[in-house]
């Protein structure tokens, strides 16, 4: 819950739904100054559980474009470059927050929404052994 | 930019900073009804590039708790259960949006912030050969 000492300089809210409805500044502050996210951009190809990235676009959502990972194989790539079906390629998923325009098509009114996205794939030992 | 036909039923905004400052309903709508995120909860242990999850807490951020993956090994686990340093465990990173209280300690005023989080790890063929 929100139990933080209130700053006397906070904007006032007369909204009857307060604290459910808040003001959000959309000028994004980027905290990733010391890290280069492009550094990992080739992992999808070099991984033993490679994946493809699919563009998911929705103008009613912010951000409107999200990239979804889909594992290329059921198994994992072995040292010979072949798919080994004794191991499984699986998606690593993460719940993220997005803003959904509500009511629809409104430029200045949103609702927080939680969505599950696949970020990449990893190679795991199977728990169900389909391959003898 | 925001160039969507405006719904006549949209809330009105007299804010001079509009459209940079918007109203957001914090009642989260969860779109993940058909997915079980717990299904991937053991991948961190079963992966050939296993990871630990570290809790990152910040009361000035929403969500206040974010889990960060840290790969356990430099190399990847081979079929014998040993670490193979001819392959690299690397973090899969994703840029996510969070809300940062602005001004600080305000319960109803936020700014969008982009942060880079490590979601899990994957095993890749090296580009830098540290191991002969």
């Amino acid at each position: 819950g929100i139990t933080i000492p209130r700053n006397p300089g906070c904007p006032n809210s007369e909204d009857k739904n307060f604290p459910r409805t808040v003001m959000v500044n959309l000028n994004i502050h980027n905290r990733n100054t010391n890290t280069n996210p492009k550094r990992s951009s080739d992992y999808y190809n070099r991984s033993t559980s490679p994946w493809n990235l699919h563009r998911n676009e929705d103008p009613e959502r912010y951000p409107s474009v999200i990239w979804e990972a889909k594992c290329r194989h059921l198994g994992c790539i072995n040292a010979d470059g072949n798919v080994d079906y004794h191991m499984n390629s699986v998606p690593i998923q993460q719940e993220i927050l997005v803003l959904r325009r509500e009511p629809p098509h409104c430029p200045n009114s949103f609702r927080l929404e939680k969505i599950l996205v696949s970020v990449g794939c990893t190679c795991v030992t199977p728990i169900v052994h389909h391959v003898a | 930019g925001i160039t969507i036909p405006r719904n006549p039923g949209c809330p009105n905004s007299e804010d001079k900073n509009f459209p940079r400052t918007v109203m957001v309903n914090l009642n989260i709508h969860n779109r993940n009804t058909n997915t079980n995120p717990k299904r991937s909860s053991d991948y961190y242990n079963r992966s050939t590039s296993p990871w630990n999850l570290h809790r990152n807490e910040d009361p000035e951020r929403y969500p206040s708790v974010i889990w960060e993956a840290k790969c356990r090994h430099l190399g990847c686990i081979n079929a014998d259960g040993n670490v193979d340093y001819h392959m690299n465990s690397v973090p899969i990173q994703q840029e996510i949006l969070v809300l940062r209280r602005e001004p600080p300690h305000c319960p109803n005023s936020f700014r969008l912030e982009k942060i880079l989080v490590s979601v899990g790890c994957t095993c890749v063929t090296p580009i830098v050969h540290h191991v002969a």
Partner: nanobody, 123 residues
Amino acid sequence: QVQLVESGGGLVQAGGSLNLSCVISRRTPSGYAMGWFRQASGKEREFVAAISWIGGGAVYADSVKGRFTMSRDNAKNTVYLQMNSLKPEDTAVYYCNDMPYGLDTTMDDYDYWGQGTLVTVSS
């Protein structure tokens, strides 16, 4: 900004030993591994050793394998480099740094280094 403080360098005779320390003064390093690197006068900075914070496994450059040992103390946010059987060609400034991509980290991934600690091996 992460702060890295290396210490333990000095002048030593060939065949001698030194133990370097590196303290990371941030709550938790951003990466999952730490590395030691060195730069000899007029040469490019090169990888020496790396260690995983969690698993503790270490990897070494061929030139130091069997002579250098890297270890870490998670509670103190400190890594060490025990250098034995030192050779004149080990003379360099030694640096430590976070390895955000583990063994996949390249020199291009860094925009910050500590001051380093000078190791001089005389023959």
